[in-house]
């Protein structure tokens, strides 16, 4: 089986987060860091409302996920720190008339971080 | 409320240049990606070029890429498109337009539109 | 570069007839499908985003649907205010791109 190569994060709002290299595709399917950082961009009214500080760290953890060459899937956020994030800044997106994205379905990611489901927690 | 007006249109010769402008209010620009859609005279809508809330990031249409600039001066609430070695098939409507969705881009505001025609 | 193409190019049709537009992404989009309306002379008005979520303020009579290539924008009864052109524009993956529009006229 061939080796996962990582790639480094070149998405500047993902970069100083703890980690720094990612695969594509992303959990949203984008094969290209160009094509996910377009869709990041329009998170930026939410990021600098406050709403939660787990915010950017989540997102990035979607579009960019941790990425390990002793792993073959990407490891994205955990459905305990979607659901925190949800909680806190739903209410702000609703207050911009947008809807929670059905992208980020707080259901398509593991409940928490174990040896057969690996997640950052946040 | 959200306004957006462009500026900046006219007439010029193919291979000359024009600076378009769109004065933004109503919203907090530095928060949102902007971009320039256009349209060519009884044509379909085609997106030219695209710029962070930061300014740090740029996307383009592969036809002007190497020949418009877009930037944004955030002191000004304004958004230009530079546009170099115009041919006649950049003769169109250009709207500027504040972009977000949240995941999704859209175009939620537009501006009325600023026309621009390369002709000898 | 994923191309948007959309049928029919135009339509006739009745106040109070069911409308149905059609968009056909050349590759999958999943849900990043976005509609607009636009009327002559004036700027397109976004009226649904990621495929089937009504913007703000749009009249409910609007609804889209779809996901991967196939996308769907109804008007579930034509109002007088509705004969426009539409364009369906996806957001997956630059360039973005939008279908050539569909123009509703009066029958």
């Known amino acids: 089986e061939e080796e996962r190569r990582c790639d480094p994060i070149r998405i500047s709002m993902c970069q100083n987060l703890g980690y720094n290299v990612t695969k594509m595709p992303n959990l949203v399917g984008h094969e290209l860091q160009t094509d996910a950082e377009l869709q990041l961009t329009t998170f930026t009214p939410l990021i600098q409302y406050g709403c939660s500080s787990q915010l950017q760290f989540f997102l990035c953890s979607v579009y960019v996920p941790m990425c390990t060459e002793k792993i073959n899937i990407p490891i994205g956020p955990c459905g305990g720190m979607c659901l925190s994030v949800k909680r806190r800044c739903e209410p702000v997106l609703k207050e911009f008339g947008f809807a929670w994205p059905e992208s980020l379905n707080c259901s398509k990611f593991p409940p928490q971080n174990d040896h057969n489901h690996m997640c950052m927690e946040g | 409320e959200v306004q957006l007006v462009e500026s900046g249109g006219g007439l010029v010769k193919p291979g000359g240049s024009l600076r378009l402008s769109c004065a933004a209010s109503?919203?907090?620009?530095?928060?949102?990606?902007m971009s320039w859609v256009r349209q060519a005279p009884g044509k379909g809508l085609e997106w030219v070029s695209a710029?962070?809330?930061?300014?740090?990031?740029?996307y383009y249409a592969e036809s002007v890429k190497g020949r418009f600039t877009i930037s944004r001066d955030d002191s000004k609430n304004t958004l230009y498109l530079q546009m170099n070695s115009l041919k006649t098939e950049d003769t169109a409507v250009y709207y500027c337009?504040?972009?977000?969705?949240?995941?999704?881009?859209?175009?939620?505001?537009w501006g009325q539109g600023t026309l621009v025609t390369v002709s000898s | 570069d994923i191309q948007m193409t959309q049928s029919p190019s135009s339509l006739s049709a009745s106040v109070g007839d069911r409308v149905t537009i059609t968009c056909r992404a050349s590759?999958?989009?999943?849900?990043?499908l976005n509609w607009y309306q636009q009327k002559p002379g004036k700027a397109p008005k976004l009226l649904i985003y990621?495929?089937?979520s009504l913007q703000s303020g749009v009249p409910s009579r609007f609804s889209g649907s779809g996901s991967g290539t196939d996308f769907t924008l109804t008007i579930s009864s034509l109002q007088p205010e509705d004969f426009a052109t539409y364009y369906c524009?996806?957001?997956?993956?630059?360039?973005?791109?939008f279908g050539g529009g569909t123009k509703v006229e009066i029958k």
């Open positions: 337009a504040r972009a977000t969705g949240f995941g999704t881009v859209v175009f939620d505001y």
């Open positions: 109503g919203f907090t620009f530095t928060s949102y990606a």
């Open positions: 710029i962070s809330g930061s300014g740090g990031s740029t």
């Open positions: 590759q999958s989009i999943s849900s990043y």
């Open positions: 990621a495929a089937s």
């Open positions: 524009q996806q957001s997956y993956s630059t360039p973005l791109t």
